[in-house]
């Protein structure tokens, strides 16, 4: 009969399965594990050995002992070329008293399960059945390399065959190929190439820009020391063995240079004293950007033409330029550096800051009580604002009323043409504190120093004004 099965391949060491007779014999179970049987080899009388021995008890006649079961010898070391087909087998003769024998295949300690092409054939005779387990591999690959064994389970015992080592020979196989590199001009560097067989040895030739570098091959692994390059080059390595030649990938070795200038410098946001810019980095010159420099020049015929330099990280490609004058025009450029040096400056772009808030407070603030109208009169002088602060659009008046632990702040806005205002008395028997700030489109300027006036209860009259002195009048 013939039985086709998907077969498994070879686990780690089996306790006590020492084999010295190039046969795999079965060990008998014992309370403490495997109990090797001491016996004499049938092929070498008188030479004791221990093995995985299956000692059949008695025949059907019930008298004579049967010889130990063992797989027959076979070719142990099979060498073949990649993509060839191979077939190998294990054979054993089993007395017919044994039932339910199963053979499994193992490879490098792991059972071979699944769609492997394994066939077991049975040839029964009067007393014994010859069993041949065949294993075939079509178009062998490198991954088929390894030790294959058969195992036969018989009456819960295990018989292990001698190994069959399959050696698949083919073209060299790279385990390490040269890597692309960016190198400094005229500076030495190393490239590594490693390939394996079988067959070995594997010899390495190096190739630079399609020309061989070494006349004599080097044994794998090989390290090529290149004394230095002045221009880009492509390197590869050839691995040779008795089966032929394999060529590695070609790798480009680039020469580090200064970066190209950044491009597309853009303005994202402008305020009175800052400008947010971004840029597109140029080519990095085969060396990572380290940092960038933002250069800022004031475009003003009256300025001294000095350049402000702001250093920033190379990433993100954005920078907020601060400490700028309000309502001013600037020319902005960006340069970036790598380990070799600085790029040229990007094309310059023009940018402007917006109006700023006033930098000084209104002057000569005076406050007095107009009791008849139940309000407070406030007067001031227009501040001396700079051009950059922009056009005055009005004033903001803050008046705080404090009485018996209660405090309330109110804000009033008045137009730019005014230099006086009236506010209603909010609380009697209280202190009113007044501050005034100038307002432009750029924002609210600083508040004047506070001026306090006491608002008495009804009937008390005090016309004396409170005021802040003008600068220099103190």
């Amino acid at each position: 009969r013939e039985e086709a099965k998907p077969y498994p391949l070879f686990p780690g060491p089996l306790p006590g399965s020492l084999q010295t007779d190039h046969t795999s014999l079965l060990s008998l179970p014992h309370t403490s594990g495997y109990q090797p049987a001491l016996m004499f080899s049938p092929t070498q009388p008188g030479r004791p050995y221990t093995g995985n021995v299956a000692i059949p008890r008695v025949t059907s006649a019930g008298s004579k002992l049967l010889p130990p079961l063992a797989f027959k010898h076979t070719v142990g070391h099979i060498i073949l070329s990649e993509h060839k087909d191979v077939k190998f087998n294990c054979s054993i003769s089993v007395p017919n008293i044994y039932q339910d024998t199963t053979i499994s295949w193992w490879k490098d300690g792991k059972e071979l399960l699944g769609a492997h092409h394994a066939i077991t054939q049975f040839y029964p005779d009067d007393e014994v059945t010859a069993i041949i387990a065949s294993f075939s591999i079509t178009s062998v690959q490198r991954s088929d390399n390894g030790s294959y064994i058969c195992k036969m389970k018989i009456n819960n015992e295990e018989i292990v065959s001698d190994p069959i080592y399959i050696e698949v020979q083919g073209l060299p196989h790279f385990t390490k190929q040269p890597e692309s590199m960016n190198v400094t001009r005229n500076t030495a560097f190393n490239l590594t190439c490693q390939a394996v067989g079988p067959p070995e040895p594997v010899n390495i030739f190096w190739v630079q820009n399609s020309s061989r570098v070494n006349e004599q091959p080097e044994k794998s692994p090989s390290v090529l020391t290149v004394p230095g390059l002045t221009e880009m080059a492509v390197f590869s390595c050839e691995a040779h063995n008795d089966k032929g030649l394999t060529v590695s990938k070609g790798v480009q070795i680039n020469i580090k240079a200064i970066p190209s200038p950044p491009t597309e410098v853009s303005i994202h946001n402008s305020t009175a004293h800052s400008i947010l810019i971004s840029w597109v980095p140029g080519f990095d010159g085969y060396s990572p950007f380290r940092n960038c420099s933002v250069q800022v020049k004031e475009v003003d015929p009256l300025s001294n033409g000095s350049v402000m330099i702001f250093n920033t990280s190379a990433s993100p490609h954005m920078y907020q330029i601060k400490q700028l004058q309000a309502l001013a025009n600037y020319s902005i450029g960006v340069s970036c550096m790598n380990e070799i040096g600085w790029s040229a400056v990007s094309p310059w772009i023009l940018a402007s800051t917006t109006e700023g808030a006033p930098s000084v407070a209104p002057l000569n603030v005076t406050v007095f009580l107009n009791e008849s109208r139940d309000n407070v009169d406030i007067r001031w002088m227009k501040p001396l604002t700079k051009r950059q602060a922009g056009e005055l659009v009005g004033y903001r008046i803050s008046h705080v009323w404090q009485s018996a632990g209660i405090s309330k702040e109110l804000l009033e806005e008045v137009g730019q043409n005014n230099s006086r205002a009236q506010i209603s008395v909010q609380v009697h028997n209280a202190t009113c504190t007044v501050r005034i700030a100038a307002v432009t489109k750029g924002g609210v300027g600083p508040f004047s120093d506070p001026v306090k006036i006491f608002i008495p209860a009804h009937g008390w009259v005090d016309h004396a004004p409170s005021s802040t002195p003008a600068p220099g009048n103190a």
Partner: antibody
Framework: QSLEESGGRLVTPGTPLTLTCTVS????????LGWVRQAPGKGLEYIGI??????TYYATWAKGRFTISKTSSTTVDLKITGPTTEDTATYFC??????????????????WGPGTLVTISL | DIVMTQTPASVEAAVGGTVTIKCQAS??????LAWYQQKPGQPPKVLIY???HLASGVPSRFKGSGSGTQFTLTISDLECADAATYYC?????????????FGGGTEVVVR
């Protein structure tokens, strides 16, 4: 790929001695490494081997007298525990022929070191 | 352990001649047998493995044969460079151990 033995010297009997095999371009997690010795004017004598998995096997005569261990990714040591004058020899380390993370394999020797001389004398 | 017995211990032959070295294993080792060449002051060099397979770079004048317990190395068209000591090695192994052993060596003298 290369191997080099070191540590060979003159010692008195009974003085433990450790020899080191340093490999270059060989992955010891893929290849087995064996030790073989050769007494002056005599033949090669197999001592033992350490597989890629770290399992060690010794010739019967060498058991208990020698210890093989992997001490780093590039070095394998052979310790001679209690040398006698009969252990005077050149000691070679050699790489097994086949790669593979297995405890057992067909370990003939493909690449050899130049050897290191050990002299045991009073 | 497996014992490898090599014969003869020494052999002399003329340039262009043929030398045959025999190696016997104390038990069957299938074809797990290698042959090495060793010259004075040098480590051994593998010539043949799997009993008959020529190692890379080895001239085809070297031929290995045999299986089981009996093995032969034949060197034909002998050259002066072939003067060396030759060793056989069993590298038989099982699923639980390995059985490495060298033969005693054969000195080949080329005259």
């Amino acid at each position: 790929q290369s191997l080099e033995e070191s540590g060979g010297r003159l010692v008195t009997p009974g003085t433990p001695l450790t020899l080191t095999c340093t490999v270059s371009g060989i992955d010891l997690s893929s290849y087995a490494l064996g030790w073989v010795r050769q007494a002056p004017g005599k033949g090669l004598e197999y001592i033992g081997i350490i597989s890629s998995t770290g399992t060690t096997y010794y010739a019967t005569w060498a058991k208990g007298r020698f210890t093989i261990s992997k001490t780093s990714s590039t070095t394998v040591d052979l310790k001679i525990t209690g040398p006698t004058t009969e252990d005077t020899a050149t000691y070679f380390c050699a790489r097994g022929a086949y790669a593979g993370y297995v405890a057992f394999g067909p370990y003939y020797f493909h690449i050899w070191g130049p050897g290191t001389l050990v002299t045991i004398s009073l | 352990d497996i014992v490898m017995t090599q014969t003869p211990a020494s052999v002399e032959a003329a340039v262009g001649g043929t030398v045959t070295i025999k190696c016997q294993a104390s038990q069957s080792i299938s074809n797990f047998l290698a042959w090495y060449q060793q010259k004075p002051g040098q480590p051994p060099k593998v010539l043949i493995y799997a009993a008959s397979h020529l190692a890379s770079g080895v001239p085809s004048r070297f031929k290995g044969s045999g299986s089981g317990t009996q093995f032969t190395l034949t060197i034909s068209d002998l050259e002066c460079a072939d003067a060396a000591t030759y060793y056989c090695q069993s590298y038989f192994y099982s699923s639980t151990s390995i059985y490495n052993a060298f033969g005693g060596g054969t000195e080949v003298v080329v005259r």
